[in-house]
């Protein structure tokens, strides 16, 4: 399906609004430090150029690839070397190396100030004064902070952002209407970004076979009534979409995602009974709805897998003839029977089955060798089941904040070399699994919990790759995608770690503590907790609890004092001394 002008093709397919939005996202994800106005100028230039190509596909440069056009445009930025340093060297390369170079310089933790939310009236005025600029600013600010955000999904978030302002800026109580909606968009956006980051890591670090295996398992759980051939077709198309988005090919990605949504809605009968309500919606909403659709009901009478995958005399023959197809069918059959398993567990089971066939199909009596293969699955299944049970019990006992603290201690002891902000961020997010998953019925707990943990641990891996400090983290992150979570779970106290020297400055607090939001206070306390564990990795739970209780009491006391700063100055050193004594 070749076109004389790729840029004209995509402009016509996507329409001007989506075209401009996606180009802005692409540029903002590549050049994360550039000012908004610079990006808007570049986008307008690209859009004008695209229009000339729509008018005449044979016009000069219209035959160039999108990477060439976009890369040339990015390389016109005057301050590239001053702002980005060695990323400017990318511009000396030819495509496709230049694009690969830009991709490698995407920064998962850019040094950008946290977004501050202005007063509601200020936001509503800005929205009414220039709606288009207001929405572009949203795309820009999110995209530069989340350089792997799923671009067509970000357009959907922007549409919801626009709808929230359109509705709430006319409401009697603007704040009561708007703020909960913005909070929801922020939280959903962070979750969406993290989920997409795992997809990109899967493709980039482990290859498309790993991503396809993930997709077979997940789509088979979602669409258990669909035939294997149908699931395979969806997996192939979905892999193409995500490969494009993760590779910075956002126009192609959005176009192909729209095609996939169209195909699914035209073929609902052979996919799932749950697609109907999604398919009546407009494009962005439809694609989002299809991606989030609930699992269809399992067919009534699915037979055991033993006949085809253990008892059949043709197991090794079928495996040898087409290994990936045979394993894909095994994964499909297993996953459609087990929506109660995490995708990662299903992939571990497929891996174990593959390893058994590799060994047994070379043995003297293959059938005798693999006859008990399913028995070997039991411990693999019970490990995450037990983990979820234990951690949900702990969450119910402690509540979210103290559960996060337990995880902070646990993970700091495992990998104390990791930076404190990273440990705090990751452990806080690990702790959110409780509220998210533990309230669910038994059959939904494991898929919710383990697949969420995989997303959070990928964030740790991505941050650690940028600044590697722990061989144990590197090992867990790189050896096996499906075994990352069990690898981290299995880590014990790092005996080789030399405790961090005590630094009183780390435990010095001021009156500004009192004006912080509850969340910010928690982060401060959790930062101190990590530093305590780094100083005394062998401290007991009781010792740490004692210090943290004293800390909370000290902060509460000083925040109630008339002269807060004087209180912190006087009581702070006492708290530090008492803490050191308690941990001695």
């Amino acid at each position: 399906d070749t076109h004389k002008s790729e840029v004209a093709h995509r402009f016509k397919d996507l329409g001007e609004e989506h075209f401009k939005g996606l180009v802005l996202v692409a540029f903002s994800q590549y050049l994360q430090q550039c000012p908004f106005e610079e990006h808007v100028k570049l986008v307008n230039e690209v859009t004008e150029f695209a229009k000339t190509c729509v008018a005449d596909e044979s016009a000069e440069n219209c035959d160039k690839s999108l990477h060439t056009l976009f890369g040339d445009k990015l390389c016109t930025v005057a301050t590239l070397r001053e702002t980005y340093g060695e990323m400017a060297d990318c511009c000396a390369k030819q495509e496709p190396e230049r694009n690969e170079c830009f991709l490698q310089h995407k920064d998962d933790n850019p040094n950008l100030p946290p977004l501050v939310r202005p007063e509601v009236d200020v936001m509503c005025t800005a929205f009414h004064d220039n709606e288009a600029t207001f929405l572009k600013k949203y795309l820009y600010e999110v995209a530069r902070r989340h350089p792997y955000f799923y671009a067509p999904e970000l357009l959907f978030f922007a549409a919801r952002y626009k709808a929230a302002f359109a509705e709430c800026c006319q409401a009697a109580d603007k704040a009561a209407c708007l703020l909960p909606k913005l909070d929801e968009l922020r939280d959903e956006g962070k979750a969406s970004s993290a989920k997409q980051r795992l997809k990109c890591a899967s493709l980039q670090k482990f290859g498309d076979r790993a991503f396809k295996a993930w997709a077979v398992a997940r789509l088979s759980q979602k669409f258990p009534k669909a035939e294997f051939a149908e699931v395979s077709k969806l997996v192939t198309d979905l892999t193409k979409v995500h490969t494009e988005c993760c590779h910075g090919d956002l126009l192609e990605c959005a176009d192909d995602r729209a095609d996939l949504a169209k195909y699914m809605c035209e073929n609902q009968d052979s996919i799932s009974s749950k697609l109907k309500e999604c398919c009546d919606k407009p494009l962005l909403e439809k694609s989002h709805c299809l991606a989030e659709v609930e699992n269809d009901e399992m067919p009534a009478d699915l037979p055991s897998l033993a006949a085809d995958y253990v008892e059949s005399k043709d197991v090794c023959k079928n495996y040898a003839e087409a290994k990936d197809v045979f394993l894909g069918m095994f994964l499909y059959e297993y996953a459609r029977r087990h929506p109660d398993y995490s995708v990662m567990l299903l992939l571990r089971l497929a891996k174990a089955y593959e390893a058994t066939l590799e060994k047994c199909c070379a043995a003297a009596d293959p059938h005798e060798c693999y006859a008990k293969v399913f028995d070997e699955f039991q411990p693999l299944v019970e490990e995450p089941q037990n983990l979820v049970k234990q951690n949900c019990e702990l969450f119910e006992q402690l509540g979210e904040y103290k559960f996060q603290n337990a995880l902070l201690v646990r993970y700091t002891k495992k990998v104390p070399q990791v930076s404190t902000p990273t440990l705090v961020e990751v452990s806080r997010n690990l702790g959110k699994v409780g509220a998210k998953c533990c309230k669910l019925p038994e059959a939904k707990r494991m898929p919710c919990a383990e697949d969420y943990l995989s997303v959070v641990l990928n964030r740790l891996c991505v941050l650690h790759e940028k600044t590697p400090v722990s061989e144990k983290v590197t090992k867990c992150c790189t050896e096996s995608l499906v075994n990352r979570r069990p690898c981290f779970s299995a880590l014990e106290l790092d005996e080789a770690y030399v405790p961090k020297a005590f630094n009183a400055e780390t435990f010095t607090f001021h009156a500004d503590m009192c004006t912080l939001s509850e969340k910010e206070k928690q982060v401060k306390k959790q930062t101190a907790l990590v530093e305590l564990v780094k100083h005394k990795p062998k401290a007991t739970k009781e010792q740490l609890k004692g210090v943290m209780d004293n800390f909370a009491a000290f902060v509460e006391k000083c925040c109630k004092a008339d002269d807060k700063e004087a209180c912190f100055a006087e009581e702070g050193p006492k708290f530090v001394a008492a803490s050191q004594a308690a941990l001695a």
């Epitope: 009901e297 399992m298 699915l302 055991s304 897998l305 029977r337 109660d340 399913f374 039991q378 299944v381």
Partner: nanobody, 115 residues
Framework: QVQLVESGGGLVQPGGSLRLSCSAS????????MGWYRQAPGKQRELVAS???????HYADTVKGRFTISRDNSKNMVYLQMNSLRAEDTAVYYC?????????WGQGTQVTVSS
């Protein structure tokens, strides 16, 4: 070794009720399907009702609205509540539990609906 034992069958008048129970002894893990089947004299065994791991229930058209299947995961038990029984419900009722590694059947319990 897994063994399934059905109970609760017996003789009942048309319009009456029975509750069948099936318990699994032995180690059976990873159950994805629990079902009740029946076989009347001279007929094929047929699915009456099943419940899958996601909680989906399925019923034969002839029993819809009269029979209810339920389970207790923690005890590996499956039940069949049968109301408004008819003469044509007379059969041996079998319990079936499946995991990926096998299909496990009970010995059956006789249900006779007669006045």
């Amino acid at each position: 070794q897994v063994q399934l034992v059905e109970s609760g069958g017996g003789l009942v008048q048309p319009g009456g009720s029975l509750r069948l129970s099936c318990s699994a002894s032995g180690s059976i893990w990873g159950i994805y399907h629990m079902g009740w089947y029946r076989q009347a004299p001279g007929k094929q065994r047929e699915l009456v009702a099943s419940i899958t791991v996601d909680g989906s229930t399925h019923y034969a058209d002839t029993v819809k609205g009269r029979f209810t299947i339920s389970r207790d995961n923690s005890k590996n038990m499956v039940y069949l509540q049968m109301n408004s029984l008819r003469a044509e419900d007379t059969a041996v009722y079998y319990c079936d539990i499946r995991n990926v590694g096998g299909d496990y059947w009970g010995q059956g319990t006789q249900v006779t609906v007669s006045s």
